[in-house]
């Protein structure tokens, strides 16, 4: 399986909300002994590998933001901890998973990574990740809503707040 990032760049005004999205692409094994662990974290475009280093998002670690469930199930974090930080991660049965960040500040700018681990009991872990950039802007040059740039082309889309 692979992870697709529909958008590689999100440019948002300060104070806006944004939902960063990743999509799990098949074939996805939904067997009894397969579990999926999904999470989010901040990182950097390192010399060795992008998304290798795992930094917190608003002081929440990737452990705090984790989702774990069988291949056919949906999951949602309703952690008070995450919501107190203006964050919510969610996943649906179609393979989409996301993190919503509320009331963006300039400090939220940076590289964000989604991580999916396919766990096969008594075998191994298969991990894949996706990366996307968030730029939070302020002042007269800031867009009125988030503008997202698709990973596959240079065309941009204007999206309303999450």
């Amino acid at each position: 399986f692979k992870v697709a990032t529909p958008y590689s760049l999100y440019v948002c005004p300060e104070g806006q909300n944004v939902t960063l999205t990743c999509r799990l692409l098949g074939p996805v094994d939904k067997g009894h002994d397969v579990t999926f662990y999904k999470t989010w974290y901040r990182s950097s475009r390192g010399e060795v590998q992008t998304c290798s280093e795992r930094r917190p998002i608003r002081n929440l670690t990737f452990q705090d933001l984790a989702l774990a469930h069988g291949g056919a199930q949906a999951a949602n974090t309703s952690h008070d901890l995450a919501q107190r930080h203006g964050l919510e991660s969610a996943s649906d049965a179609a393979g989409n998973f996301s993190i919503t960040m509320r009331n963006l500040t300039l400090l939220d700018s940076g590289l964000y990574c989604c991580l999916v681990v396919e766990i096969r009991a008594a075998a191994s872990e298969h991990r894949v990740h996706g990366a996307m950039e968030l730029q939070v802007q302020t002042g007269k040059d800031a867009p009125s809503n988030c503008v997202v740039y698709p990973s596959s082309s240079q065309d941009s889309e204007n999206i309303t707040a999450a």
């Epitope: 662990y37 060795v48 590998q49 290798s52 984790a66 774990a68 991580l115 191994s124 991990r127």
Partner: antibody, heavy 117, light 107 residues
């Protein structure tokens, strides 16, 4: 702050079953592997096995025929049973949180189990 | 089962010196390797994950490098509290295995 605490008898007779429990406090038992690792006196670390919060398990083949790990999410506990023990099973037994695609990031303080008649 | 071989078994150094610890895998583990520190009577403590990333709260004097089969843990300048046993651990497949450990002792 997640903390782990092992509990169980410190002395077990040969051929009997070693039983230990690990209590998870300060956080959720969901979304992680919960592992048992042991360390014989003066020796290195050996992974025994894990249970996922959903109940799926994975054991070290060297111990698989004798090991059972179970979880009670309502009590935030997971347990180890090791049957037919011998003196070679004398060790400090640790429970640990194991994050998928990461590492053992939180450990209990360990409990010494001696197998002797 | 992947076998991890650590060398040297014992490293005798003075505070302020540089420590270089090696871990070699019997087959490639990509960069899926962690390092732990263990002091007498204590549980191991995670230092490095994915070969070269420091865990939360670990001082910058600890660094990891390598990929494939050969890995190194470096302590740039030993502090008194760094004298301990260090273990590497792979997680590319199961069973998860640890190296035999390297003891860093005061010279």
């Amino acid at each position: 702050q997640v903390q782990l605490q092992e509990s169980g008898p410190g002395l077990v007779k040969p051929s009997e079953t070693l039983s230990l429990t690990c209590t998870v406090s300060g956080g959720s038992i969901s979304s992680y592997y919960w592992s048992w690792i042991r360390q014989p006196p003066g020796k290195g670390l050996e992974w025994i096995g894990y249970i996922y919060y959903s109940g799926s398990t994975n054991y070290n083949p060297s111990l698989k025929s004798r090991v059972t790990i179970s979880v009670d999410t309502s009590k935030s506990q997971f347990s180890l049973k090791l049957s037919s023990v011998t003196a070679a099973d004398t060790a400090v037994y640790y429970c640990a949180r194991d994050i998928p695609a990461f590492a053992f990031d939180i450990w209990g303080q360990g409990t010494m189990v001696i197998v002797s008649s | 089962e992947i076998v991890l071989t650590q060398s040297p078994a014992t490293l005798s150094l003075s505070p302020g010196e540089r420590a270089t610890l090696s871990c070699r895998a019997s087959q490639s583990v990509s960069y899926y390797l962690a390092w732990y520190q263990q002091k007498p009577g204590q549980a191991p403590r995670l230092l490095i994950y994915d070969a070269f990333n420091r865990a939360t709260g670990i001082p910058a004097r600890f660094s990891g490098s390598g990929s494939g089969t050969d890995f190194t843990l470096t302590i740039s300048s030993l502090e008194p509290e760094d004298f301990a046993v260090y273990y590497c651990q792979q997680r590319i497949n199961w069973p998860l295995t640890f190296g035999g450990g390297t003891k860093v002792e005061i010279k």
